[in-house]
């Protein structure tokens, strides 16, 4: 007896009869930048404050007839999805609406900027609890809109935006492409990407996660008790804004980085049929559907990590790609991936006082991606130890030699174009898990971290015969921090983390003879923090 | 999600020093850039967001806006300052002819200029 979308985001423990999770986001204020709204609709009456902010362009067309209920349609529905009495996600959240979209649902980058500035000034004048800003709109890529979002996010505001309804790479749109914003794609009742006419949800590495966005029942501006179904990435973003409000109400001190990691962690994994996405976007698009956490507390003990893909490097010989973590996150490992298999590896390097992950294209390569593993590790002290190419035939190796430092990731980078083509695999000597091993022509980089209670272990999975994909996963209670391929397999396209699984991809097996060179080994570094677990037990 | 990518047009105008000296050259070594939406139907030429360098104060933003208006007037162009930004980004929103872009890019404190564009409900 509840709408499918509310059931979908609700963990089983709340599903007894009705959707009634505890504490409906009452400590949080959600700002909505959208059309005008019907604030006396029963779903939202008394919980949405219409601000006096309005910055909209004139409607197109001389014969446009401004009908109140149509002008309010989009915003009213979204306000209802976020905080509606009956069909809302965060039934206790209070909202403030700013009108930046006209009766045709059209606005401007400049109007949105002025709206964001209005929110920042309001926050300074009257500081309240946690703020969530919902931006259910999209335009072309805009440097200035992304910059404004970055500034607002760094002022402690959580921004949630629609990925866009253009069946396209979300990185081509703003604010969807802003790294600091939580960007949400849309899925349907079958957990499939939403199709909207000839278009549909956007996808790609700029999407953080998906959420219900098709046939979403919500407040209709047609009448004060009416409901209507609407679809789009706006509806999906509204779900995530509601979930964020719930999480922040339960834990008001959560930072943006912590919130994003929790949203990812509690999402349903690997339920989306990736065949809907263009082939080149499948690996980049997160297979995550948002859900509420099963309980309001107890997540603090977890070591949270996420995978961040860079933009494509482009095909030039010296092209590089850089993946960055958020300011509050630690880069615990760095890997690379190339569809052609022609790459020169990757390295962790300092940039502006922070480690970044840089991948290098090779001559004749179509380009590379850098893949950063970004984690929340309080009081961490991480450094990169590098070993230059070795002369010895045993290959290059490097370990974490500082007292109390553990290995969280391995990277290798080489200057030669045809590394390892005719060389046998180099195997890690047993009993030395705290070191990285690589080709003798490669420089090897070990990510070594010290943090209270941090412990890590190496897990390998090798397949002797050629395989397009080899995976190794960390067990329950452990979090994947590093993912790499054991050297010696020249046909490896790269390695990357998907949730808690390390994936090593190889060239199409039909093009690889089943020689010893066909052996592929995936190496995962799995970590956990006893300190975080103890701290959470003490809280409880 | 990266700030610096996207199917995105960046027009870096290599500025010649042929101006009449009324505009101070930007701090040496930095060239202000012009950006516009890659999706042509979404462009809104005639309105521009002038973004100033990060630490620019409100008074400097207002002064830069007035300076642009004065220099535009000398060339016979009408401009209108629609909004002065402060709190998030320093800068201002100006309604002006695209002919004035080269002039605006030479103003002191200018980091980049972006042509306004449309956004849509999703």
């Amino acid at each position: 007896s509840i709408p499918w979308n509310l059931e979908r985001i609700t963990p089983p423990r709340y599903r007894a009869d009705e959707y009634q999770p505890p504490d409906g986001g009452s400590l949080v204020e959600v700002y909505l930048l959208d059309t005008s709204i019907q604030s006396d609709h029963r779903e939202i009456e008394g919980r949405v404050m219409v601000t006096d902010f309005e910055n909209v362009p004139e409607e197109d067309g001389t014969r446009f007839h401004r009908q109140a209920s149509k002008c309010d349609s989009h915003g009213t529905h979204l306000a209802g999805v976020v905080s509606g009495r009956d069909a809302g996600v965060a039934k206790g959240a209070s909202m403030r609406s700013l009108r930046v979209l006209n009766c045709q649902g059209k606005g401007t980058v400049s109007g949105t900027l002025i709206g964001l500035e209005f929110i920042r000034k309001s926050q300074l004048v009257q500081p309240v609890g946690p703020l969530v800003v919902l931006l259910p709109l999209a335009g072309g890529y805009s440097r200035v809109l992304n910059a404004a979002c970055q500034r607002l996010a760094r002022a402690g505001v959580v921004l949630v935006t629609a990925a866009g309804n253009f069946r396209d790479d979300a990185c081509l749109y703003s604010p969807a492409s802003a790294p600091e914003v939580i960007t949400v794609g849309a899925t349907n009742a079958q957990d499939q990407p939403v199709t909207l006419g000839t278009l549909g949800t956007n996808f790609g590495r700029c999407v953080d996660l998906f959420a219900p966005g098709e046939d979403i029942i919500g407040a209709s501006s047609d009448c004060s008790t009416c409901f209507v179904s609407q679809s789009g990435t706006s509806q999906a973003a509204a779900h995530v804004a509601g979930i964020a409000a719930m999480m922040l109400s339960a834990e008001p001190e959560l930072t943006l980085a912590e919130l994003r990691q929790r949203l990812i962690h509690f999402s349903a994994k690997d339920v989306i049929n990736e065949a809907w996405f263009p082939e080149d976007q499948r690996v980049l698009t997160p297979n995550l559907v948002a859900a509420l956490p099963p309980s309001t507390h107890g997540a603090g003990w977890q070591l949270f990590c996420r995978t961040v893909w860079s933009a494509h490097s482009g095909p030039t010989r010296m092209a590089t790609a850089v993946a960055r973590c958020a300011p509050d996150e630690e880069l615990l490992s760095c890997s690379s991936f190339s569809r052609s298999g022609k790459r020169r590896g990757e390295r962790m390097e300092a940039q502006g006082g922070k480690l970044v992950c840089r991948a290098h294209n090779a001559f004749g390569g179509e380009g590379v991606y850098a893949i950063a593993r970004c984690c929340l590790l309080p009081q961490a002290n991480c450094s990169v130890h590098t070993a230059p190419p070795a002369e010895a035939s045993m290959g290059t190796r490097v370990h974490c030699h500082q007292q109390g430092h553990v290995l969280t990731g391995c990277s290798s980078h080489w200057e030669v174009e045809d590394l390892g083509t005719h060389k046998p695999p180099v195997l890690r000597p047993r009993g030395q898990p705290n070191q990285c091993v690589g080709h003798r022509e490669a420089s090897i980089h070990a990510s070594c971290c010290h943090a209270p209670g941090l412990e890590c272990k190496v897990k390998e999975h090798g397949i002797p015969a050629p395989q397009e994909q080899v995976t190794v996963a960390c067990e329950e209670g452990w979090t994947l921090t590093g993912c790499s391929a054991l050297p010696g397999t020249s046909h490896v396209l790269g390695a990357y983390a998907v949730d808690n699984t390390c994936v090593v991809r190889s060239r199409d097996v039909s093009t690889t003879g089943s020689t010893s060179e066909g052996a592929v080994t995936a190496v995962a570094i799995c970590c956990r923090s006893r300190h975080l677990a103890q701290a959470s037990q003490e809280l409880q | 999600q990266e700030d610096e990518d996207g199917d995105y047009e960046e027009l870096v105008l290599a500025l010649r020093s042929e101006e009449d000296g009324l505009a101070e050259a930007p701090e040496h070594g930095t060239t202000a850039t012009f950006h516009r939406c890659a999706k042509d139907p979404w462009r809104l030429p005639g309105t521009y967001v002038v973004v100033l360098k990060e630490e620019t104060h409100l008074s400097q933003s207002e002064r830069t806006a007035r300076r642009l208006q004065a220099q535009a007037a000398r060339r016979g162009y009408l401009t209108k300052i629609l909004h002065v930004f402060h709190g998030l980004l320093p800068g201002f929103l100006v309604k002006m002819s695209g002919d004035l872009l080269e002039l605006a890019l030479k103003l002191p404190h200018v980091d980049y200029i972006e042509e306004d564009s449309s956004v849509f409900a999703q």
């Epitope: 007896s1 709408p3 009705e18 009956d86 047609d222 009416c226 | -």
Partner: antibody, heavy 126, light 106 residues
Framework: QLQLQESGPGLVKPSETLSLTCTVS??????????WSWIRQPPGKGLEWIGS???????YYNPSLKSRVTISVDTSKNQFSLKLSSVTAADTAVYYC??????????????????WGQGTLVTVSS | EIVLTQSPATLSLSPGERATLSCRAS??????LAWYQQKPGQAPRLLIY???NRATGIPARFSGSGSGTDFTLTISSLEPEDFAVYYC????????FGGGTKVEIK
């Protein structure tokens, strides 16, 4: 079959608080599909909606009565109640409780009032 | 608030005749209008909802029409049990009822 039954004092003094309870039988009050409403009818006059509540206790009141009205719900007893403060003779009416389909679950039926209780007359007099 | 004005206040007709009741809204209520029947000593009963849809169990002689501000309830051939008071109600904005039309036997 769902039935609603109003109960409470038939006589209230001016300036006091009118209190009525509606007991729902033949169905559960704890459903997202419905709102539970109070409507009144002064003798020989038309109907006036007072306010509504859902099983979660979320209320929605007539703006003209909002300052005086409190509606509450007790799901364990399958009841909802009305309190109207500072009453005057103008509040003398037959008070009805009724179910209203919320519209959230379209299958629940049309978004209007029905069924109704049989009504209880409350007289405000000293 | 939206005011609903019903006319006539009283309609005197004989069984078998056609009854036409009018309800006018002070502003558009789109099609969000219902008709109720109330007999003496009883609670109202829903007849027509969303301007023209018959509620469950309501005979076909009852029909509703109109949208925006002007609405009509028609009883094609009055039966003895149809003599009662009829109210219109809108839900475009909050809930308001009309003053009622009494259909009495002539």
């Amino acid at each position: 079959q769902l039935q609603l039954q109003e109960s409470g004092p038939g006589l209230v003094k001016p300036s006091e608080t009118l209190s009525l309870t509606c007991t729902v039988s033949g169905g559960s009050i704890s459903s997202a599909s419905y709102y539970w409403s109070w409507i009144r009818q002064p003798p020989g006059k038309g109907l006036e909606w007072i306010g509504s509540i859902n099983y979660r206790g979320s209320t929605y009141y007539n703006p003209s009565l909002k300052s005086r009205v409190t509606i509450s719900v007790d799901t364990s007893k399958n009841q909802f109640s009305l309190k109207l403060s500072s009453v005057t003779a103008a509040d003398t009416a037959v008070y009805y409780c009724a179910r209203e389909n919320s519209g959230v679950v379209p299958a629940a039926g049309p978004n209007w009032f029905g069924p109704w209780g049989q009504g209880t007359l409350v007289t405000v007099s000293s | 608030e939206i005011v609903l004005t019903q006319s006539p206040a009283t309609l005197s007709l004989s069984p078998g005749e056609r009854a036409t009741l009018s309800c006018r809204a002070s502003q558009s209520v789109s099609s969000y209008l219902a008709w109720y029947q109330q007999k003496p000593g009883q609670a109202p009963r829903l007849l027509i909802y969303d301007a023209s849809n018959r509620a469950t169990g309501i005979p076909a002689r009852f029909s509703g029409s109109g949208s925006g501000t002007d609405f009509t309830l028609t009883i094609s051939s009055l039966e003895p049990e149809d003599f009662a008071v009829y109210y219109c109600q809108q839900r475009r904005n909050w809930f308001t009822f009309g003053g009622g039309t009494k259909v009495e036997i002539k």
